[in-house]
Interface confidence: medium
C-alpha cells in the first residue's frame, strides 16, 4: 500500500508515534517519506547482505528475520515480511524499539540526512488529526 501523507500521519498518530521518545509526528512522516516514499512494500538491499523492509525501511541484520541475513539479531522478533503489510502495526511497534535503542531517530539515515533540523511539522500541516 502507498499511503497518502495525511493518511499515514493519522495512522501513525493512532499507533502512538506522536511525540514517542520526544519525536513529533512530523519526524515520523518525514522519515517514512524519504525512506520508502510512503510505500509499505518497499524493500532495498544493502551491501552487507541485509535488506531494509517496509514503510520505515527496517533492517534485517538487527531488527527482523528474513531467513537469509548472516548473523541476524531479530531484535523485534518478527519476520521481515510482516513489515510489508498494509497494516503498519508491526512496523510501528518495531520502530518504537529502534528509537528506544539509544540513538533515537538517528538510526534512520534518511531522517538524519533529510529531516533532522528541518521544519518537519510541514509534513503534517493541513492534516485532520
Amino acid at each position: 500500500k502507498v499511503f497518502g501523507r495525511c493518511e499515514l500521519a493519522a495512522a501513525m498518530k493512532r499507533h502512538g508515534l506522536d511525540n514517542y521518545r520526544g519525536y513529533s509526528l512530523g519526524n515520523w512522516v518525514c522519515a517514512a517519506k524519504f525512506e520508502s516514499n510512503f510505500n509499505t512494500q518497499a524493500t532495498n538491499r544493502n551491501t552487507d547482505g541485509s535488506t531494509d523492509y517496509g514503510i520505515l525501511q527496517i533492517n534485517s541484520r538487527w531488527w527482523c528475520n528474513d531467513g537469509r541475513t548472516p548473523g541476524s539479531r531479530n531484535l523485534c522478533n518478527i519476520p521481515c515480511s510482516a513489515l510489508l503489510s498494509s497494516d503498519i502495526t508491526a512496523s510501528v511497534n518495531c520502530a518504537k524499539k529502534i528509537v528506544s535503542d539509544g540513538n533515537g531517530m538517528n538510526a534512520w539515515v534518511a531522517w538524519r540526512n533529510r529531516c533532522k533540523g528541518t521544519d518537519v511539522q510541514a509534513w503534517i500541516r493541513g492534516c485532520r488529526l
Epitope: Q41, T43, G67, R68, P70, S81
Partner: antibody, heavy 116, light 107 residues
Amino acid sequence: QVQLQESGAEVMKPGASVKISCKATGYTFSTYWIEWVKQRPGHGLEWIGEILPGSGSTYYNEKFKGKATFTADTSSNTAYMQLSSLTSEDSAVYYCARGDGWYCYWGQGTTLTVSS
Amino acid sequence: DIELTQSPATLSVTPGDSVSLSCRASQSISNNLHWYQQKPHESPRLLIKYASQRMSGIPSRFSGSGSGTDFTLSINSVETEDFGMYFCQQSNSWPRTFGGGTKLEIK
C-alpha cells in the same frame, strides 16, 4: 518438512513464452524469498533473481531483466517464473530454491528445451 | 559482480584419498561462502554454509575453511558416493554468484 515442487519439462518454439511453477510446502511461504537459478551444461549455475511472495517484491540479475518475470500466489503457495522471447540459449534446467542466503531447499528442476 | 573461481576443474581420485577443492573470490566476501554437491540429474545439495558450518546430515569427512577471498572444501577419505560436481556460492552481495564447479571423478 520443507519441499519445493516444480512443474514438468517443457518443449517450446523460439519466440514463445513459458511459465514455470514452484509449489512450496512445509513452511510459511510468504516470509521467505524464493530464488530462481538456471543451469546449462558447461555454463554452471546462474542466479536469475528472487521474489518475496508476501509482498511481491522482486529483484533480477541484470542479465535476465526483460527475460524473466516472477510472480507468486500466496493462496496456493506457488511461485512462478515466466520466460519470454525464448531462444536456444534459454534451453536449460531451471530450479527454484528457498532463499536463505544459502540454498538448503531446492525444487527438482524444470527442463526447458527450445527447439523449432 | 563477484566472480568465484574454482580449481581444479577436474579432480581424479581413488576412494580413500583425501582431497581439497579451492574456491577463490574476486573480492572479499567475509565468510559468506557456501558449498554444494550435485550428482547427475539431481538438484544441488548443500554441504557447508558460511564457509565452515556443516549442514545436518552431512558426513563429518566434509569440512570447510577460509575467509575473505580463499576458501577450501576438504573431503577426508573420499567414498564412492562423493563423486560428482562441487560448486561454491557467495551470498555476500547481489547478484548471487556460483563458481564454475569442480568435478570429482574416480581415477
